[in-house]
Interface confidence: medium
Amino acid sequence: SPVPPSTALKELIEELVNITQNQKAPLCNGSMVWSINLTAGVYCAALESLINVSGCSAIEKTQRMLNGFCPHKVSAGQFSSLRVRDTKIEVAQFVKDLLVHLKKLFREGQFN
């Protein structure tokens, strides 16, 4: 049976918590990703940014979970209108920013 949206968001948040707390070496070897506008369409925008990171097992589960939230198919190299123009940040910082934003969405009761 489908997982309730609130449960799915909790699980995504917990996965991001695990990533930030279990980080020993630089996450994804210090890979850089496009920074995104967190105010709208956050799940698809985050996936469009993170999908360009390959060979990083630490975020593979996050990528799969974000895919479940995004209603359309996302592929590597896809341009997002929600990305912050010409700004790249480390995956570790991206995950931290995304985590705080998703917790705020959860606190607001916005599960979709």
Epitope: K10, I13, K103, F106, R107
Partner: antibody, heavy 122, light 108 residues
Amino acid sequence: QMQLVESGGGVVQPGRSLRLSCAASGFAFRTYGMHWVRQAPGKGLEWVAVIWDDGSNTHYADSVKGRFTITRDNSKNTLNLQMNSLRAEDTAVYYCVRAPQWYLTAEAFDLWGQGTMVTVSS
Amino acid sequence: SYVLTQPPSVSVAPGQTARITCGGNMIGAYLVHWYQQKPGQAPLLVIYDDVDRPDRIPERFSGSNSGNTATLTISRVEAGDEADYYCQVWDHNTQQMVFGGGTKLTVL
């Protein structure tokens, strides 16, 4: 400097009413959610009520719902708490508190007043 | 409504590390804030959004949050850290702010 100053506390009989006020200064009052938090003697903190920046939304603790009303006047930088049908268990120090807003949720309480004491006793 | 559980008291020797816990169902999904309150004073925000520290709060204060427990950690504890500490979250289900019961930190 940024400041919140409460007034209106005192001794009141059970069943009666009291109105608390809070004067804000040193910051853009109209851009913040405002809360009341209380603390009974020797007890922990208890959240009482919130009103959003534009006054459009209010929420209350179950213990005061239907008896207390939170209002604000952004033109005068004041926050109020109208307390009706007071009970002995409402005896506490009442703090006026500022919190940044994120849509319709409260962020951390980053500025507190010094509190005003309300005693409900016959 | 959402319930936050704190130990009533924690004792620690000066210079040691104090850990104050705040338990709640899947609290890791919530943003947790921590306040310090000394006798006769209003509370003071010491940690917000799980891990962030306001200006003027020493680096000795840190926070973490995952699973069912949030933790306030105070390293190299000083006598001046003796106070009551409260955790707090916003509960979207009831649209209410919730405080833990508070923990009295005693510096031996």
